[in-house]
Interface confidence: low
């Protein structure tokens, strides 16, 4: 069974998939559609790297631009380095500025809803 066939079989279960399953899926050439991606748990999407999301979506990665103001894409963008987002070439804005350090402080995020940024 190829990656696409496997994806079709498990598509209906993906809404609650944890991060590790999504990371594994990104290596299987599944080309997840945007509608499915938008239904994923935000907390499962946030830890994914730009490269992992790009592999997960395949040719559908361009759809991130249309969804950049909506969860989970909006929250995921806020967690990525702007440099990394720029490699997608989609004009996604709102990433962590170059030279900033991300402190993964759960309390800070609970209060503000965004990662804590330290300047250079």
């Amino acid at each position: 069974m190829n990656g696409s066939e496997y994806f079709v079989k498990i598509q209906s279960f993906l809404g609650g998939a944890p991060t590790e399953d999504l990371k594994a899926l990104s290596q299987q050439n599944v080309s997840m559609d945007l509608a499915t991606f938008m239904k994923l748990r935000t907390d499962a999407v946030l830890p994914l790297t730009v490269a992992e999301v790009q592999k997960l979506l395949g040719p559908h990665v361009e759809g991130l631009k249309a969804e950049e103001r909506h969860r989970p894409v909006r929250d995921w963008i806020l967690r990525q380095r702007q440099d990394d987002l720029d490699t997608l070439g989609l004009g996604l804005q709102g990433g962590i500025p170059n030279g900033y350090l991300v402190l993964d402080l759960s309390m800070q995020e609970a209060l503000s809803g965004t990662p804590c940024l330290l300047g250079p």
Epitope: Q54, G58, V61, G63, D86, L88, G89
Partner: antibody, heavy 120, light 107 residues
Framework: EVQLVQSGAEVKKPGASVKVSCKAS????????MHWVRQAPGQRLEWMGN????????NYNEKFKNRVTITVDKSASTAYMELSSLRSEDTAVYYC?????????????WGQGTLVTVSS | DIVMTQSPDSLAVSLGERATINCKAS??????IAWYQQKPGQSPKALIY???YRYSGVPDRFSGSGSGTDFTLTISSLQAEDVAVYYC?????????FGGGTKVEIK
């Protein structure tokens, strides 16, 4: 902001060659294929070929394979399309259009076009 | 090569009315289709990719649908600025190919 600035209009004699340039800015040049598409007066758009600026790899439309050469100058973020053995039916507007290497080639950005006129 | 056949060649629609353009691929291209708008003397402008996704900044009156071999671009309420030629393009396989274009005018 993505910008693609093409060289100016050219008038050529049949049998001659023409080299059109496309200077790119606003994105990472080596992260995008550069495609060339032409449009003869009143005709449909016609894909000619592309080049991967990172690897130098290319694909050509068989129709042009022996006459077209697509190259890049990475240091200048510029792509070139050279068409040889020109004939009157090569009179057309030639466009450059990039697409992100990791996705399928839909063209969100286009150069302004370069008119090439072939006339004796 | 995959041949993209558009219909109709031209279309006259009243302002505020719906315009529908069809594109048929000679073989299955999945949803690997884009739609472009071209006004006289201008470069093509991307409207839709992956058959149904609008590019950023494209008004929501433009929508795309279809998969496999049959695709449709719909302008739900035609505006004066929509007068143009519309092209479909398949990017399922090389060589990339375009439809012959549909000219949309105001009735």
């Amino acid at each position: 902001e993505v910008q693609l600035v093409q060289s100016g209009a050219e008038v050529k004699k049949p049998g001659a060659s023409v080299k059109v340039s496309c200077k790119a800015s606003g994105y990472t040049f080596t992260s995008y294929w550069m495609h060339w598409v032409r449009q003869a007066p009143g005709q449909r758009l016609e894909w000619m070929g592309n080049v991967n600026p990172s690897s130098g790899g290319s694909n050509y439309n068989e129709k042009f394979k022996n006459r077209v050469t697509i190259t890049v100058d990475k240091s200048a973020s510029t792509a070139y399309m050279e068409l040889s053995s020109l004939r009157s039916e090569d009179t057309a507007v030639y466009y450059c259009a990039p697409h992100y290497i990791g996705s399928r080639p839909g063209f969100a950005y286009w150069g302004q076009g370069t008119l090439v006129t072939v006339s004796s | 090569d995959i041949v993209m056949t558009q219909s109709p060649d031209s279309l006259a629609v009243s302002l505020g009315e719906r315009a529908t353009i069809n594109c048929k691929a000679s073989q299955n291209v999945g949803t690997n289709i884009a739609w472009y708008q071209q006004k006289p003397g201008q470069s093509p402008k991307a409207l839709i990719y992956s058959a149904s996704y609008r590019y950023s900044g494209v008004p929501d009156r433009f929508s795309g649908s279809g998969s496999g071999t049959d695709f449709t671009l719909t302008i739900s309420s035609l505006q004066a600025e929509d007068v143009a030629v519309y092209y479909c393009q398949q990017y399922n396989s090389y060589p990339l190919t375009f439809g012959g274009g549909t000219k949309v005018e105001i009735k």
